[in-house]
């Protein structure tokens, strides 16, 4: 609530300020126009949460957020005759909303989730300190190509961690990446705190590894390409080459942003094919070849998941030893 | 076969530093979180510091809080304690234990001497 | 933090005997206990986990029981490779602790 009787030239606070959660993460607070405001008031509404965060004035009569709820979220509001910022509002009303109960040593940790090559998502989890060894756990999943909140079904368990994986595939709808994944992990007996996280399509991309199709040899250079991973087109990956030589056993690594098939050299025109060109290889030398991908900033916020590892190749002979 | 190896204990004097190692062997390494336990002379066992398998979640006794910093590399299967302002009562064989399901230690190393002494 | 005492602090025992120690919690634990056996100068080794069960590989002399806040470790017919310190230990929450010790000698 406010406090102190509000000077004259500001407006009477909101009324009937109320919050609920829809889907898993979708906080939402509405609030009916203050009462006995001034006729010739053309209102505004100016909101924030309770750190002074993410300042708005607006004329609707409600505000959302998309946050997981692990922790207790408020919105203040208060209610002007304008959209200027320096206009002292009404006396502000704060409405919050906790986080569901529970001990919050029972509630899972590290909670986070993969999207595997646009394809399906893998979410993993260390229980919490304060829990019973036979803990039977459940995760919740929605994402707004979904009319209702789903259950994951396949609970597996790698090590220390508990997982579940959905499917989860790219639609060709372009907004479709710049919405998130609400996910909630909570117990089947209702005995540990749920946890929330929320993950945005534009990060935690790991795309399959490429395949590589035709290593060959120009002079002493070597031409390397390959199919990249479905569903990402070239643009939006940077790629790593790795090319050992048995004879040296030399070791290098190439880190290729842009690979373009332009050369002669290269079979051209197939559909999502990259190329690189390795220069000074021994043709007469065994060499092996491997490259994995990994998203880039151009398209996606994320660029630290590499793929796993094509299949090597190898081109040249291996020398006898003599 | 799993296993654990310690390396890195030594002679130091007080106010120094060590940094102990620890190298996996047998396991999906990143799955699975790995603690420091310590033993001084003819005492019993004490817990030190665990690191989660992706590093996210460290913990400390409050005995060596602010002195001594886990770590890991997953990708070389290693775990690492850095010990900074060694004092004479940090002397100790110190374990490194890989931790499974729920807190429970089911491979411990042969252990590695840290002597603190001027 | 959970404090653990372990009894007796130590026992001389002959083969052939059925061993009890015991470990008490300053507070309830459920079944967030484990034993661990220390052979001279060897690293300790897991033997009961969650109070109860077994590790593999131990042999079922060995077994545990208790809840809540008093645990029992027993050995059933001693043999002469038993002579060790015992701990046991809570892992209800940080910091784990582990109790004193319990150091068995073979007459």
């Known amino acids: 609530g406010g406090g102190g009787a509000a000077p004259t030239e500001t407006q009477p606070p909101v009324t009937n300020l109320s919050v609920s959660v829809e889907n898993l993460c979708t906080v939402i607070w509405t609030w009916n126009p203050p009462e006995g405001a001034s006729s010739n008031c053309s209102l505004w509404y100016f909101s924030h949460f309770g750190d002074k965060q993410d300042k708005k004035i607006a004329p609707e009569t409600r505000r959302s957020i998309e946050v997981p709820l692990n922790e207790r979220i408020c919105l203040q509001v208060g209610s002007q005759c304008s959209t200027n910022e320096s206009e002292k509002p009404s006396i502000l009303v704060e409405k919050c909303i906790s986080p569901p109960e529970g001990d919050p040593e029972s509630a899972v940790t590290e909670l986070q989730c993969i999207w595997h090559n646009l394809s399906y998502m893998k979410c993993s989890w260390l229980p919490g300190r304060n829990t019973s060894p036979d803990t039977n756990y459940t995760l919740y999943y929605w994402h707004r190509s979904l009319e209702k909140i789903h259950q994951c079904e396949n609970i597996f368990r790698e090590g220390q961690y508990f997982g579940c994986s959905f499917d989860l595939t790219k639609v060709k709808d372009s907004s479709f990446e710049q919405h998130s994944v609400q996910i909630m992990v909570k117990d089947n007996a209702g005995k540990i705190k749920p946890s929330f996280n929320i993950v945005p399509l534009t990060s935690r991309v790991k795309p399959d590894p490429p395949h590589i199709k035709n290593l060959s040899f120009h002079n002493d250079d070597l031409y390397v390409q390959w199919e990249n991973p479905q569903n990402f087109i070239s643009r939006c990956l940077f790629y790593e080459v790795e090319v050992n030589n048995s004879q040296t056993e030399t070791h290098n690594v190439f880190y290729v942003q842009e690979a373009k098939c332009e050369n002669p050299e290269f079979e051209r025109n197939v559909e999502n094919t990259s190329c690189f060109m390795v220069p000074g290889v021994l043709p007469d030398t065994l060499n092996t070849v491997r490259i994995r991908v990994k998203t880039n900033k151009l398209c996606y916020e994320d660029d630290k998941l590499w793929s796993n590892w094509s299949q090597e190749m190898s081109i040249g002979k291996k020398r006898n030893s003599t | 076969e799993v296993q654990v190896l310690e390396s890195g204990g030594g002679l130091v004097q007080p106010g120094g530093s060590l940094r102990l190692s620890c190298a996996a062997s047998g396991f999906t390494f990143s799955n699975y979180a790995m603690t420091w336990v310590r033993q001084a002379p003819g005492k019993g066992l004490e817990w030190v510091s665990t690191i989660s398998g992706r590093g996210y979640s460290i913990y400390y006794a409050d005995s060596v809080k602010g002195r001594f910093t886990i770590s890991r590399d997953n990708s070389k299967n290693t775990v690492y304690l850095q010990m900074n302002s060694l004092r004479a009562e940090d002397t100790a064989v110190y374990y490194c234990?890989?931790?499974?399901?729920?807190?429970?230690?089911?491979?411990w190393g042969r252990g590695t001497l840290v002597t603190v002494s001027s | 933090e959970i404090v653990l005492t372990q009894s007796p602090d130590f026992q001389s025992v002959t083969p052939k005997e059925k061993v009890t120690i015991t470990c008490r919690a300053s507070?309830?634990?459920?079944?967030?206990l484990h034993w661990y056996q220390q052979k001279p100068d060897q690293s300790p080794k897991l033997l009961i986990k969650y109070a109860s069960q077994s590790f593999s590989g131990v042999p079922s002399r060995f077994s545990g029981s208790g809840s809540g806040t008093d645990f029992t470790l027993t050995i059933n017919s001693l043999e002469a490779e038993d002579a060790a310190a015992y701990y046991c230990?809570?892992?209800?929450?940080?910091?784990?602790?582990f109790g004193q010790g319990t150091k068995l000698e073979i007459k």
């Open positions: 230990k809570s892992s209800a929450g940080l910091p784990y602790t």
């Open positions: 507070q309830s634990i459920g079944s967030s």
């Open positions: 234990a890989k931790e499974e399901g729920h807190w429970y230690f089911d491979v």
